[in-house]
């Protein structure tokens, strides 16, 4: 008995060939001996089966002795043994229809679980293997689960169903809803304008939701809301913004925030949360702000940074084109009685400069002591 695997919703063509290469009488029946279709001369006739409106044949092939049964929009319950009766012969074809669906939705939030469920006919014992867009293989039976979806899991998942040494392939497009970056850090000199951007890693026709940027300033004892907003069909409208700092928000995607000036009291870290329509859970992106200030007070030249810096970052003070006068893994460095000239304060990571602030030290003219 020949075995043919089909996919739910697809079309299958079951073949039946006569030894004579001409149009002769044939019938297709199911295992209950109910006629599905056949011919009467050059006419196609249909029986009382459940497949009535979905069954067809290819009349153009009859003259060549081929009498296929075409079943459209396959259903799991179409799985059966189909019998072709031609020239006093019976050809049996076992059709097994499988379906593979993703749980609830193919648009899932980062960190959520993806469950793929295999629909299969009674009595079958298929095995399933799926390959993710990043090449990860998962195997299972009726259900396959992937926990903690990552951004790289977005794309086409290819799943192969194996039954009776035959295989059928399914392709499922999964969209992982996430920000492009889980975390970002902005380095700014005091007084500079700060731009925060929160690009999404997916595109959808309509995007509706709401969000908030919640901020913990390093120098503040508690965190607070900096801005709340709504998103309607990709249009952003600000709901409420704190008075200090007075943030501005772009009206279009990607989500974009502007802080008029970087000040030490704003340095810290924030969490932008976005709730999307028809989604359980929220998208998050962490954003960090590091602010640098270089000052000269009397005979003391000081450079300070505020905000979340890693312990391996180096803060240095150096006179232009000279070796660093002071270099420490600390958040403040200073030089007493600095020489005149252009001084540079540098925040660097393994030699790479992340932030630089220049300050000019003027020469101090010592007034001669009067006799």
């Amino acid at each position: 008995k020949k075995v043919v695997l089909g996919k739910k919703g697809d079309t299958v063509e079951l073949t039946c060939t006569a030894s004579q290469k001409k149009s002769i009488q044939f019938h297709w029946k199911n295992s209950n001996q109910i006629k599905i279709l056949g011919n009467q001369g050059s006419f196609l006739t249909k029986g009382p089966s459940k497949l009535n409106d979905r069954a067809d044949s290819r009349r153009s092939l009859w003259d060549q002795g081929n009498f296929p049964l075409i079943i459209k929009n396959l259903k799991i319950e179409d799985s059966d043994t189909y019998i072709c009766e031609v020239e006093d012969q019976k050809e049996e074809v076992q059709l097994l229809v499988f379906g593979l669906t993703a749980n609830s939705d193919t648009h899932l939030l980062q960190g959520q679980s993806l469950t793929l469920t295999l629909e299969s006919p009674p009595g079958s014992s298929p095995s399933v293997q799926c390959r993710s867009p990043r090449g990860k293989n998962i195997q299972g039976g009726k259900t396959l689960s992937v926990s903690q979806l990552e951004l790289q899991d977005s794309g086409t998942w290819t799943c192969t169903v194996l039954q009776n040494q035959k295989k059928v392939e399914f392709k499922i497009d999964i969209v992982v809803l996430a920000f492009q970056k889980a975390s970002s850090i902005v380095y700014k000199k005091e007084g500079e304008q700060v731009e925060f951007s929160f690009p999404l890693a997916f595109t959808v026709e309509k995007l509706t939701g709401s969000g908030e940027l919640w901020w913990q300033a390093e120098r503040a004892s508690s965190s607070k809301s900096w801005i709340t907003f709504d998103l309607k069909n990709k249009e952003v409208s600000v709901k409420r913004v704190t008075q200090d700092p007075k943030l501005q928000m772009g009206k279009k995607l990607p989500l974009h925030l502007t802080l008029p000036q970087a000040l030490p009291q704003y340095a810290g870290s924030g969490n932008l949360t976005l709730a999307l329509e028809a989604k359980t859970g929220k998208l998050h992106q962490e954003v960090n702000l590091v602010v640098m200030r270089a000052t000269q007070l009397q005979k003391n030249l000081t450079c300070e940074v505020w905000g979340p810096t890693s312990p391996k970052l180096m803060l240095s003070l150096k006179l232009e084109n000279k070796e660093a006068k002071v270099s420490k893994r600390e958040k403040a460095v200073w030089v007493l009685n600095p020489e005149a000239g252009m001084w540079q304060c540098l925040l660097s990571d393994s030699g790479q400069v992340l932030l630089e602030s220049n300050i000019k030290v003027l020469p101090t003219w010592s007034t001669p002591v009067q006799p």
Partner: antibody, heavy 119, light 107 residues
């Protein structure tokens, strides 16, 4: 520790006036929106009014518009509710509330002060 | 004004039971929904913000879901201290409005 302490409640005749005060401590009062929420005896909660950080924005429920005025004094860390032309239906426990929670949530509530409007 | 309708208005349950309270907004409010718990003679306590995010310190047996107009608060396994009245509140537009409350009573 965040603390909100209401005062000024009491018995007043219909048509009369009352001024509620709320003393705030344990947080930077001038950084937060503040609200008044009331609860009639045995009934549910009703938001009454709120005010932004510098007092420039104020919103009220329709039933108190033109009769109640919300105000604040950031130097004194105090929130006020001036209630005029009081009616029997204004009888309730009045709560002073901080709007400091994520997503505009009302995160800290005072213990409430009872206002009874009756002849 | 946006009307908030809670159901049921009261529910009798036993310790360990799963309790679900629903809240429906008369128009879409996105995720601007907060849940509060109030015990007799006490001020309300803030439980859940943005429809589904748990306020820190609130036990994980409490959970919220929903977006737009339909929201739910679920207590997965009722504890003795959970017998109280629960209110939903919208912060989408002024005037802010509360649901009428759902009283969770001991069966």
């Amino acid at each position: 520790e965040v603390q909100l302490v209401e005062s000024g409640g009491g018995l007043v005749q219909p048509g009369g006036s009352l001024r509620l005060s709320c003393a705030a401590s344990g947080f930077t009062f001038s950084s937060y929106w503040m609200s008044w929420v009331r609860q009639a005896p045995g009934k549910g909660l009703e938001w009454v009014a709120n005010i932004n950080q510098d007092g420039g924005e104020k919103y009220y429920v329709d039933s108190v518009k033109g009769r109640f005025t919300i105000s604040r004094d950031n130097a004194k860390n105090s929130l006020y509710l001036q209630m005029n032309s009081l009616r029997a239906e204004d009888t309730a426990v009045y709560y002073c509330v901080r709007e400091g929670g994520q997503w505009l949530a009302l995160d800290y509530w005072g213990q409430g002060t009872l206002v009874t409007v009756s002849s | 004004d946006i009307q908030m309708t809670q159901s049921p208005s009261s529910v009798s349950a036993s310790v360990g039971d799963r309790v679900t309270i629903t809240c429906r907004a008369s128009q879409g409010i996105s995720s601007w929904l907060t849940w509060y718990q109030q015990k007799p003679g006490k001020a309300p306590k803030f439980l859940i913000y943005a429809a589904s995010s748990l306020q820190s310190g609130v036990p994980s047996r409490f959970s919220g879901s929903g977006f737009g107009t339909d929201f739910t608060l679920t207590i997965s396994s009722l504890q003795p201290e959970d017998f109280a009245t629960y209110y939903c509140q919208q912060a989408n537009s002024f005037p802010w409005t509360f649901g009428q409350g759902t009283k969770v009573e001991i069966k």
